[in-house]
């Protein structure tokens, strides 16, 4: 089999026939050096998954539940291409599983016990697996058989396809539990009708169900959605209030050596030639000899799944939690109203050591998880491997796009009411050596630059955003002659000045000596012409305040700031000479952990915060001798956000817009993956 062949896995005679037709028609339109199709027939989707894992086949299209199976060891498959529905301009690759209730019913998600429930059907995704999976640990024990536990949880249900003899309560609202449209409460529309008629209190359906059944907005306004954080939202806010976001139909491949680029090349060409309304003789999204053969008949095309996206990220935390609960049937022993330990994400070994020390001192209230980059940490928080970390504003933006929420803000100024008063922000500045007297904001081209890291606020987003507005392109590595911007591509000129050894060179963590505020300033001191840092960086590292050999003899007076009007000012005049105001660093977490992270961190800062005077003999949460480990070292306290509790509200319209403009220059694979899930 030539290397450019994609071995498609078919699960029935009809699929195999369509696959052969697909193969033959692709041959007729694609040059001989292009991708080709071969067909492999297996008895079931699980057999296909195993065949792909064993390198006997390359690709198959699966529903969400099977994508989960495909991801589990030892299969380790990943999503590579998604089918989309709707239009090319507004492609839908996901649907949302929602819980719909009547507006005046007055209960929340955590008060469903004893209510009457309407389901699309037993074992179906939005109508059963997701809601019951998420409610699993609230079900009365024993939880097996599941139907009995569900019957005892709700006071009555309609769950079409359930066994009405063994579990009559599941058929109480629809006698007989018929498994077809003969049952008026069967399927999406049926489950909604069950709620509408007043038979049930809650219907578990798809986000589109209510729109398909109620054309009139006034009618829709009589309903609300139950959110997982025990609030309610209008039915059109399903993107912010759902049980899970579920991919419709996805092509999977091996994680390693999986031919993902070849599969995309093949399917992209296939949709060009044989997609919707393209060809009479062969149609990719049509099944004359059956239904949904190889691909869904309702699909309109394909989209490439971003490479950073593994199955866990693609399926989403809520969906994975629901399915794992159903499959594994394990629940924590701790009472659910008690906070579990917060798993803090630490970057590389320096932060890990400080985190471990915190963990010991917290007596297990804090646990530690390691990752090599900030984006890896954000991904771990998304999928539940970690719970929280403190982030620079640029990463608060990425975390927000990935569905995380800010929960507390670092405050840097001493005040009587520190914890109740989140600050307006700090200043992003451009620092130069006083001796380089000809250097201004207007003649930085060809100079050597020092950045905290790619994607961070003061070190990248603000200066590069301003620069982009001037030069109108993203080739910052051509604008500066060389520099150190940790997180850049290793062969970029923006890694040339970095000092990390071997694989640590230019890494966006403390293994790279020029990483972060202190690192960028050190880069200026030792090699660079300009450093993009925060307004406190110079005073914090001069006048003997940083005992490290490179810093101990530095004098603040030897440095100046570049102002946007082309002038220069002394370092202490940052208020009148800065690039922009930057939002303070903030702690982020998943929505479901928000309350516990808030509670535990407030306890922790009372024990180990700025009130601790002797850090040589006691653990201090906000100290790490200028290394900014876990938190910035100048943090005075972690402050409540009040109503600034979304990333947009926290960062502010101006900053969100600035980072949004810079998105075209973004190299963030995580941001690409998260905007795929939520454009």
């Amino acid at each position: 089999v030539p290397d450019k062949t994609v071995r498609w896995c078919a699960v029935s005679e009809h699929e195999a026939t369509k696959c052969q037709s697909f193969r033959d028609h692709m041959k007729s339109v694609i040059p001989s050096d292009g991708p080709s199709v071969a067909c492999v027939k297996k008895a079931s989707y699980l057999d296909c998954i195993r065949a792909i894992a064993a390198n006997e086949a390359d690709a198959v299209t699966l529903d969400a539940g099977l994508v989960y199976d495909a991801y589990l060891a030892p299969n380790n498959l990943k999503p590579v291409v998604a089918e989309f529905y709707g239009s090319k301009e507004d492609p839908q690759t996901f649907y949302y599983a929602v819980a719909v209730v009547k507006k005046d019913s007055g209960f929340q998600m955590n008060q469903l016990r004893g209510k009457k429930s309407c389901h699309t059907g037993l074992g179906r995704s939005a109508g059963w697996n997701i809601p019951i999976g998420l409610l699993y640990c609230d079900l009365p024990e024993p939880r097996k058989p599941l139907e009995k536990a569900v019957a005892n949880f709700f006071s009555g249900s309609c769950a079409p396809c359930a066994d009405g003899t063994d579990f009559p309560q599941l058929c109480q609202l629809c006698p007989g539990c018929g498994c077809s449209t003969l049952n008026q409460y069967f399927g999406y529309s049926g489950a909604f009708k069950c709620l509408k008629d007043g038979a049930g209190d809650v219907a578990f359906v798809k986000h589109s169900t209510i729109f398909e059944n109620l054309a009139n907005k006034a009618d829709r306004d009589q309903y609300e959605l139950l959110c997982l954080d025990n609030t309610r939202k209008p039915v059109d806010e399903y993107k912010d209030c759902h049980l899970a976001q579920v991919p419709s139909h996805t092509v999977v491949a091996r994680s390693m050596g999986g031919k993902e680029d070849l599969i995309w090349e093949l399917l992209n060409q296939a949709q060009e030639h044989f997609g919707k309304d393209k060809s009479k003789e062969f149609q990719l999204f049509s099944s004359p000899h059956g239904k949904d053969l190889l691909f869904k008949d309702s699909a309109h095309g394909f989209l490439k799944v971003p490479p950073r996206m593994d199955a866990k990220m693609y399926l989403g935390y809520e969906y994975v939690t629901a399915i794992r609960n159903l499959r594994e049937g394990t629940c924590p022993e701790a009472p659910t109203d008690e906070c579990k330990p917060v798993k803090w994400c630490a970057l590389s070994h320096h932060e890990r050591l400080k985190c471990d020390e915190w963990s010991v001192n917290s007596v297990g209230k804090i646990e530690c998880v390691s990752a090599e980059t900030t984006e890896d940490c954000i991904a771990k928080i998304m999928n539940g491997e970690a719970d929280a970390m403190s982030l620079d504003g640029g990463f608060v933006y990425i975390a927000g796009k990935c569905g995380l929420v800010p929960v507390l803000a670092e405050n840097y100024n001493k005040s009587d009411n520190c914890e109740d008063t989140p600050e307006a922000g700090y200043f992003a500045i451009a620092v130069v050596k006083k001796s380089a007297s000809d250097l201004t904001w207007d003649n930085l081209k060809g100079k050597k630059s020092c950045h905290t890291a790619v994607g961070r606020t003061a070190g990248w987003n603000i200066p590069m955003g301003l620069l982009y507005n001037k030069i109108n392109h993203c080739r910052f590595d051509e604008f500066f002659s060389e520099g150190c911007a940790p997180g850049s591509k290793k062969d970029s000129s923006l890694c040339k000045l970095c000092m990390g050894s071997g694989l640590n060179l230019c890494e966006p963590n403390n293994k790279e000596g020029y990483y972060g505020y202190t690192g960028a300033f050190r880069c200026l001191v030792e090699k660079g012409d300009v450093a993009f840092v925060k307004h406190q960086t110079v005073p914090q590292n001069t006048g003997g305040k940083n005992p490290d050999p490179w810093a101990k003899n530095l004098n603040e007076k030897d440095y100046e700031l570049l102002c946007l009007d082309g002038t220069r000012k002394p370092v202490e005049e940052y208020a009148n000479c800065h690039l922009a105001r930057a939002p303070n660093h903030a702690v982020v977490t998943r929505k479901d952990k928000e309350a516990c992270v808030h509670k535990i961190l407030r306890q922790q800062q009372h024990l180990f915060g700025s009130n601790v005077t002797d850090c040589s003999g006691n653990f201090c949460l906000f100290r790490s001798e200028t290394k900014d480990l876990l938190f910035r070292d100048d943090t005075v306290c972690l402050a409540k956000l009040h109503d600034r509790n979304t990333y947009e509200k926290y960062l502010g319209e101006e900053y969100v817009k600035a980072v949004g403009n810079l998105r075209k220059c973004s190299t963030s694979s995580l941001l690409e993956a998260c905007t795929f899930r939520r454009p």
Epitope: H349, V360, E625
Partner: nanobody, 117 residues
Framework: QVQLVESGGGLVQPGGSLRLSCAAS????????MAWYRQAPGKQRELVAG???????NYAGSVKGRFTISRDNAKNTVYLQMNGLKPEDTAVYYC???????????WGQGTQVTVSS
């Protein structure tokens, strides 16, 4: 800078016990947190147990109920009593005083613990 020397490792059968010691060349009294770490071949170094200056202890989930950390400030020594040892406890065990945490990975020689029948 306090110098730390680990000892007490050895070969032991599953279910057996060992007591590791970590002797400090300077006073550990003023040091807040002391901890034992371990590193198995091809794995990351991981925290096993820690003890604060006031004697508060914390353990990794995998050793809870089997290992006990203690400190004797007068003798400038930290101990790790390991009972019910399992083959997966095989590793080099290190102790740290966290005082060097912000500079580099600066560890002693460690002491090898091998659990095998």
């Amino acid at each position: 800078q306090v110098q730390l020397v680990e000892s007490g490792g050895g070969l032991v059968q599953p279910g057996g016990s060992l007591r590791l010691s970590c002797a400090a060349s300077g006073s550990i009294f003023s040091i807040n947190t002391m901890a034992w770490y371990r590193q198995a071949p091809g794995k990351q170094r991981e925290l096993v147990a820690g003890i604060t200056r006031s004697g508060t202890t914390n353990y990794a989930g995998s050793v809870k109920g089997r290992f006990t950390i203690s400190r004797d400030n007068a003798k400038n020594t930290v101990y790790l009593q390991m009972n019910g040892l399992k083959p997966e406890d095989t590793a080099v065990y290190y102790c740290t005083d966290y005082s060097r945490r912000y500079y580099q990975d600066d560890w002693g020689q460690g002491t090898q613990v091998t659990v095998s029948s």
